[in-house]
Amino acid sequence: ESKYGPPCPSCPAPEFLGGPSVFLFPPKPKDTLMISRTPEVTCVVVDVSQEDPEVQFNWYVDGVEVHNAKTKPREEQFNSTYRVVSVLTVLHQDWLNGKEYKCKVSNKGLPSSIEKTISKAKGQPREPQVYTLPPSQEEMTKNQVSLTCLVKGFYPSDIAVEWESNGQPENNYKTTPPVLDSDGSFFLYSRLTVDKSRWQEGNVFSCSVMHEALHNHYTQKSLSLSLGK
Amino acid sequence: ESKYGPPCPSCPAPEFLGGPSVFLFPPKPKDTLMISRTPEVTCVVVDVSQEDPEVQFNWYVDGVEVHNAKTKPREEQFNSTYRVVSVLTVLHQDWLNGKEYKCKVSNKGLPSSIEKTISKAKGQPREPQVYTLPPSQEEMTKNQVSLTCLVKGFYPSDIAVEWESNGQPENNYKTTPPVLDSDGSFFLYSRLTVDKSRWQEGNVFSCSVMHEALHNHYTQKSLSLSLGK
């Protein structure tokens, strides 16, 4: 036996003082709203050390353990730690009805397991109002113009917005994050940029919105130079 | 001398494994753009333990130490740690010219001092284009309507938007965060909610934008039922 007794246990290296961290991500709104798509809850573990790379996941739906999750092969990161991901496919209605999804992560680098829980935001769903706004007359002096879709009054904030022209998908759009309004609902804007000549030519541009409080989870509002003339 | 030599140093408690953290915040855009206002860079230290509460700040502007910062009294948080804040007043032109501000934090709970640096986003400033959009005809069936200000093509993202009516400030507005556009510039929308009757009455509503790339750092665009008719 050493003169000084057992060696001191070493503290974790500063950069991994906290050991692994766990992040739980909800399904994409569009996936929960379209029956043809597959909604997934994703549990991500980062800062897993190379000394203790084994990560065990346990999943629970409303407190009941489920066993249909898929764990992906761990990925080495630039900082010589691992990132490990487990994905649980969820039922559309379970998510929309507010069921709770818990991911429990066990790893030797943790003093005890870490649990993270996620569910749809609580509260009464509210239907979005969707309004399309044509370009400002001032913008018509430019080569490209902005077509605007205002989506307001919705709750929860999970929503998907897309654009099309004469029934064909349009890709040159950007959507703001949902903004909390003074009444507790959310609003956002989506902006489609098109060549002025396409707007002037009378093409019909449509803003499609998917949200759980909409009839059939879907609505579409159109916009064209000739509409309302 | 103990039979087992010096006692082992205790590792930090799990919740403070990393010791204090430092966050450095830029001045408010409006403060940097209006000569009547005072722009400040703010250095915030959190998770300061009660055992080692003393925090020392050193400030540097482009590498040269300055001594005009003000450190506020530490504030105890709910989790029995302290939060300590130091504020450095900066010169408008120094910030706009891209000078770098460094906050160096020393505390016994840290193995070595922590340095955080901040400056205005690098890159060529680009002037915002500002367009006002009246309410959609469909929204005119509601009691309240949305007046929209689209601000696009600006860089960097530091910007301030306000609304007024007939020269008086309007407060019932919300502005989206800046969104990165496909050309590397930013855009945002600001939405003023007003009673339909005020809009129909012909009041003039104005969207004011402050940004460094604007002439005099300021522009204003107006909107009313009668404008453009």
Partner: antibody, heavy 122, light 107 residues
Framework: EVQLQQSGPELVKPGASVKMSCKAS????????MHWMKQKPGQGLEWIGY????????RYNEKFQGKATLTSDKSSNTAYMELSSLTSEDSAVYYC???????????????WGQGTLVTVSA | DIKMTQSPSSIYPSLGERVTITCKAS??????LSWFQQKPGKSPKTLIY???RLVDGVPSRFSGSGSGQDYSLTISSLEYEDMGIYHC?????????FGGGTTLEIK
Amino acid sequence: EVQLQQSGPELVKPGASVKMSCKASGYTFTSSVMHWMKQKPGQGLEWIGYINPYNDGTRYNEKFQGKATLTSDKSSNTAYMELSSLTSEDSAVYYCTRSFYYGNSHVLFAYWGQGTLVTVSA
Amino acid sequence: DIKMTQSPSSIYPSLGERVTITCKASQDINSYLSWFQQKPGKSPKTLIYRANRLVDGVPSRFSGSGSGQDYSLTISSLEYEDMGIYHCLQYDELPYTFGGGTTLEIK
């Protein structure tokens, strides 16, 4: 291959009406606006107006408002133009044409029909 | 309406010659200008759009330039098949308007 097949020549009396057709093939009919042009013998081109078969939205050159009426039939992928109260000034070749759009390229009037000759004569 | 003035109305160059046709708009049209070629008894064919962009399949001897109110179509070395009528079109504003046309016949 995109094709616009127009109806044959018309000889009509002054004061009468004429309805010509433009049958589209080789693309989704509702995905593109259809324009109509007038070209008098030995002269330049004039834009009459457009119809969008997607929603039947129309827009006319003011000069042809009341003279031309544009319609479309999605079931047969056909656009129509009717000209009313014809005079000798309406004697011309009339073309249907559509644009091409892909990525950032918007080519106005990229595809043309072969034209319909209308002759107004007593 | 925007008026498009095209010149010359007729031109009689030789084969291999460099030919330039111009179009002047009554106001700034922001490069929303196309050039068309029309052979006798045929439909027009687009050569150039957005003032200087060549349509796929059009020979590289054709080029467009200009901005603001003034635009031109250049054929760098004239070939026999280039004869016909050339039209310019502005599509910056409705109604779309054409120039009066330039008849190109080979000397």
